[in-house]
């Protein structure tokens, strides 16, 4: 018969002769032949391969370095890498991990409209009229003006976006 | 090898602007944030602020946050600092560093002297 | 902004002698996460500052073990045990537990 040109899906062509390739979390030791099956092998200790393959060597899982205030997420599999992030308080650079970002505080002025996670920053927003934020803060969203009227006072210094209203006793008009 | 080169020296007359380069190589330039840092003549250093290059963030001190700008090409691992409106005080040497596990390495620094 | 301070300015030491530079944070550099953001930089005459210690006490690649680093959340210390004459340069202390990033005004190591 025609030796083939093309091979079926998890298959690879080798001697004109199609060959398996390696499950997930197997690496190649030896080619098929016309008389043999593709022989593979179990990747090492904190080794991977993630797809059907005819590598000859895993790859070594990520190191999640403590020193770079990274830590272990997911533990690595033989067929999956180890996923890194960092920790508390700070958040990785890119997606590959490899370093991280000290999480921003939203300064006076600006209240946190979405608190940071291991791979995302902190968003800030602008309090708008009506609400302020007088701390630089990674976690404090902007907070409403005292209401002086439901505390039977009124509004003796207005508030801004870094202040609070100050509320003060009504003046008493004598009889 | 991790290197950070920076431009070179540059004379401005105060009101005008200075935009300063530097170059990594060596290493994943997305990876990490790169900083910048001041040092006035015989004075300590000053903390401008920093760009993350995977996602164009950058983050500022506020006292450099209406006149700074950073930015970052990754199609040539280059970092660029701006300041606009120079006065006398900002003549100092300009240092961009990476963070890694803190400012690991740094640039060679670039002297900006702003003079009339 | 949290303010470094660092004592004394100036400090001229013998060769061979120890060495101790002080750094006071107006706020503790503690996170809850159990680091000390707390670092050290040797500016050298002429060059770009360079590592030291990370995180209070963590000695940085390449550098000499007669350095050393320690404190509490709001007082560090940087220890020389026995100064060599390539030791000579500004140090400085730098908070990176929030921003802005802040550093010390500087020690200045000279040889008596």
């Known amino acids: 018969p025609e030796p083939p040109t093309a091979c079926r899906e998890k298959q690879y062509l080798i001697n004109s002769q199609c060959c398996s390739l390696c499950q997930p979390g197997q690496k190649l030791v030896s080619d098929c032949t016309e008389f043999t099956e593709t022989e593979c092998l179990p990747c090492g200790e904190s080794e991977f391969l993630d797809t059907w393959n005819r590598e000859t060597h895993c790859h070594q899982h990520k190191y999640c370095d403590p020193n770079l205030g990274l830590r272990v997420q997911q533990k690595g599999t033989s067929e999956t890498d180890t996923i890194c992030t960092c920790e508390e308080g700070w958040h990785c650079t890119s997606e590959a991990c490899e370093s991280c970002v000290l999480h921003r505080s939203c300064s006076p002025g600006f209240g946190v409209k979405q608190i940071a996670t291991g791979v995302s920053d902190t968003i800030c927003e602008p309090c708008p009229v009506g609400f302020f934020s007088n701390v630089s803060s990674a976690f404090e969203k902007c907070h409403p003006w005292t209401s002086c009227e439901t505390k039977d006072l009124v509004v003796q210094q207005a508030g801004t976006n870094k202040t609070d209203v100050v509320c003060g006793p009504q003046d008493r008009l004598r009889a | 090898e991790v290197q950070l080169v920076q431009s070179g020296a540059e004379v401005k007359k105060p009101g005008s602007s200075v935009k300063v380069s530097c170059k990594a190589s060596?290493?994943?330039?997305?990876?990490?944030?790169m900083h910048w840092v001041r040092q006035a003549p015989g004075q300590g250093l000053e903390w401008i602020g920093y760009?993350?290059?995977?996602?164009?963030?950058?983050n500022y001190n506020q006292k450099f946050k209406d006149r700074a700008t950073l930015t970052a090409d990754k199609s040539t691992s280059t970092a660029y600092m701006e300041l606009s409106s120079l006065r006398s005080e900002d003549t100092a040497v300009y240092y961009c560093?990476?963070?890694?596990?803190?400012?690991?390495?740094w640039g060679q620094g670039t002297t900006v002297t702003v003079s009339s | 902004d949290i303010v470094m301070t660092q004592s004394p300015l100036s400090l001229p030491v013998t060769p061979g002698e120890p060495a101790s530079i002080s750094c006071r944070s107006s706020?503790?550099?503690?996170?809850?996460?159990?680091?000390?953001?707390l670092y050290w930089y040797l500016q050298k005459p002429g060059q770009s500052p360079q590592l030291l210690i990370y995180?209070?006490?963590t000695l940085a690649s390449g550098v000499p073990d007669r350095f050393s680093g320690s404190g509490s959340g709001t007082d560090f210390t940087l220890k020389i045990s026995r100064v060599e004459a390539e030791d000579v340069g500004v140090y400085y202390c730098?908070?990176?537990?929030?921003?802005?990033?802040?550093f010390g005004q500087g020690t200045k190591l000279e040889i008596k």
């Open positions: 560093a990476r963070w890694g596990y803190s400012f690991d390495y």
């Open positions: 060596g290493y994943t330039f997305t990876s990490y944030t």
């Open positions: 760009i993350n290059p995977s996602s164009d963030y950058p």
């Open positions: 706020k503790s550099l503690l996170h809850s996460n159990g680091n000390t953001y």
């Open positions: 995180r209070m006490s």
């Open positions: 730098m908070q990176h537990l929030e921003y802005p990033l802040t």
